[in-house]
């Protein structure tokens, strides 16, 4: 008996045409859902003034259906039992879903101008940058719609730049129309505790983002795990979104739609600082912003985004230290909200349910050349909008899940 | 240490162009912009307008647009200044200077200056 | 643009003196005015630097204050070798612009 199904199991989970795996893998069957909540900042004058703590409100949900398309350019290697693809990124908005429209209008920083200002340190090319901010009527913050926030929109400072750089500025632009990968992943015919394991992303086996076992490309893509998953395992997954590898531990058993699956979470020590988790020394990469690496629970991805000042954490900065959420004033973090969660099936290792949730913000520095910036005393971390990316089995596919696979162990 | 070689004094007939030079020495060339000052007994200092190397970001005092064209090559780190349709107003010395970086000690190595003395 | 308005033009003081030289600005530069000394065939020195700050390197009888639009450039007990011609240089906003120059003599 258990032999029998164990075999099936491993049949069944290969990523190679004919297996329940692959048909699902190419294209995922649940309906995907990525909700944005906007923090729209009330006193803009005042953080620019005064150098106020920045007071937020976050609206939404505001809901996009995603990963709906196939992957694309699905590439078998026998040689070396890998399927290669490319994920392939689309977003349509679900107004039924949503708090309002697209064109809904918010207060948040002008990415352009924080941007620009970091990258540019030099105190001449922040003079030059502060006649154009001034210029083109630019501030510290912008007023923009939903679609340009996210999607992109020509921002009028940039296009004042006389010399070749990127005029369009969006927290997801370019988005439709562009894939994720290469992924290069093990399809699991020759080894099955190896299924869905990244082999190479981007034909590489690091970033080149970060230092040491930091940069390295660990896990699967945490759609689905190796099967026989083990609630003592602690399941290694790589994100590009956060341009980096993570991991889950298990938290508890779930029943979802009569699936016995396990719940697995993010844990507050992934996001903790060297000085508490050792492991994460390599994720500290300047001294100044991270208080000498003591600060938690905010991770500098610039080296990932073309130098921009992009720091990721989790919505309202949960699981982040004091001196982070300080300066901004209308954050209300919990777990229950905003943690992420992994709902496992164990015998084939997929991923039945799952909430991923992150927060993008940008840093803002003082600067004594660029106006606008002038007046600040303080760095800070700037939330922009935070996003809860759900997924859960169709009725349809837990019925069948449940007939073909839990009931034929139980 | 830092050091900003310019290029020697120049004649040049009224109408016609030159060309100044100005290696930079002793620090990273792109990491640091580098100015133009023009010096007459009349006008005293005139900044004429910056290059940094880095961005390629330049801009010119409005006075000499049209007047003085920035370049920088970073191969040799040197700058160069080239001005054209030179009249007897345009007589002077000419000198680079590294600008402010990251500090804001504005101007603070000067090259030896260029004299240019526009005359038929 | 920003005009810087030096005086006075030139100053003629005896060894130990004090000497002070002023520039005015037509807009707020904070505390982003810088101070040069330029000797005969010499190019200018940088002696002073935003913020009222002291370059390495040069003797602390000369200072500086000022902040907004009127700033003061001292020298405390004046020298034969202070003789030169002294500039102010607004780097706040551009067009930098410099002050018309003041030359200091030995009365």
């Known amino acids: 008996g258990d032999l029998l199904i164990q075999k099936t199991i491993k049949k069944q989970v290969v990523l190679e045409e004919g297996t329940i795996a692959f048909k699902n893998w190419v294209k995922t069957g649940t309906e995907v859902y990525r909700q944005f909540w906007i923090f729209d900042v009330q006193n803009p004058q005042e953080v620019m003034m005064n150098s106020s703590n920045i007071q937020v409100k976050q609206r939404g949900p505001y809901t996009y259906r995603v990963r709906f398309l196939a992957k694309e350019n699905v590439t078998q290697d026998a040689e070396d039992n890998t399927v290669s693809f490319l994920q392939p990124n689309g977003a349509i908005f679900e107004p039924s879903l949503s708090v309002g429209t697209e064109a809904d209008n918010f207060t948040v920083l002008n990415l352009a101008v924080a941007a620009a200002s970091h990258i540019y340190q030099n105190q001449f090319v922040q003079m030059i940058l502060n006649s154009l901010i001034n210029k083109s009527k630019s501030s510290m913050f912008q007023v923009r719609t939903l679609r340009e926030l996210l999607w992109g929109y020509r921002d009028p400072f940039l296009s004042l730049v006389p010399y070749p750089v990127t005029t369009t500025v969006g927290l997801f632009y370019p988005y439709n129309n562009t894939a994720d990968g290469v992924y290069k992943v093990f399809n699991g015919k020759d080894n099955i505790s190896k299924v869905a394991i990244i082999d190479t992303y981007k034909g590489k086996r690091n970033l080149s983002y970060w230092e040491s076992h930091c940069d390295m490309i660990n896990g699967t893509d945490a759609a689905s795990f190796p099967p026989f998953v083990e609630k003592s395992q602690v399941l290694q997954f790589f994100s590009s979104d956060i341009c980096r590898s993570i991991y889950a531990v298990f938290e508890s058993d779930v029943n979802l739609k009569g699936i016995p699956v396990y719940r697995f979470v993010l844990p507050s020590k992934a996001f903790a600082s060297p000085v508490e988790n050792p492991d994460n020394y390599c994720f500290c990469t300047e001294k100044i912003i991270s208080k000498n690496c003591t600060s938690y629970g905010v991770l500098d991805i610039s080296k990932c985004k073309e130098g921009r000042p992009v720091y990721i954490s989790l919505p309202h900065f949960l699981y982040a230290s004091p001196d982070v959420s300080e300066p901004i004033d209308g954050l209300n973090p919990n777990e229950e909200e905003h943690r992420t969660y992994l709902d496992i099936e164990p015998i084939t290792g997929f991923t039945l349910q799952f909430a991923k949730r992150l927060q993008v913000n940008l840093l803002v520095k003082p600067s004594e050349k660029i106006q606008v910036l002038k007046n600040l005393k303080r760095n800070y971390i700037v939330p922009i909008l935070w996003l809860n990316e759900t997924g859960t089995i169709g009725d349809e596919k837990a019925n069948m899940f449940r007939s073909q696979v839990t009931g034929k162990i139980n | 240490q830092v050091q900003m070689k310019e290029s020697g004094a120049e004649l040049v007939r009224p109408g016609a162009s030159v060309k100044l030079s100005c290696k930079a020495l002793?620090?990273?060339?792109?990491?640091?912009?580098i100015q133009w000052v023009k010096q007459t007994p009349v006008h005293g200092l005139e900044w004429i307008g910056g290059i940094h190397p880095g961005s390629s970001g330049i801009v010119y005092n409005q006075k000499f647009k049209g007047k003085a064209t920035l370049t920088a090559d970073k191969s040799s780190s040197t700058a160069y200044m080239e001005l054209s349709s030179l009249t007897s107003e345009d007589s002077a010395v000419y000198y680079c200077?590294?600008?402010?970086?990251?500090?804001?000690?504005?101007?603070?190595?000067w090259g030896q200056g260029s004299l240019v003395t526009v005359s038929a | 643009e920003t005009t810087v308005t030096q005086s006075p033009a030139s100053l003629s003081m005896a060894i130990g003196e004090k000497v002070t030289i002023r520039c005015i600005t037509s807009t707020d530069i904070d505390d982003d005015m810088n101070w040069y000394q330029q000797k005969p065939g010499e190019p200018p020195k940088l002696l002073i630097s935003?913020?009222?700050t002291l370059r390495p390197g040069v003797p602390s009888r000369f200072s500086s204050s000022g902040y907004g639009t009127d700033f003061v450039f001292t020298i405390e007990n004046m020298l034969s070798e202070d003789v030169a011609d002294y500039y102010c240089l607004q780097s706040d906003n551009l067009p930098f612009t410099f002050g018309s120059g003041t030359k200091l003599e030995i009365k």
């Open positions: 935003e913020g009222n």
């Open positions: 200077t590294r600008g402010g970086g990251y500090d804001g000690a504005w101007f603070a190595y």
């Open positions: 002793g620090y990273t060339f792109t990491d640091y912009e």
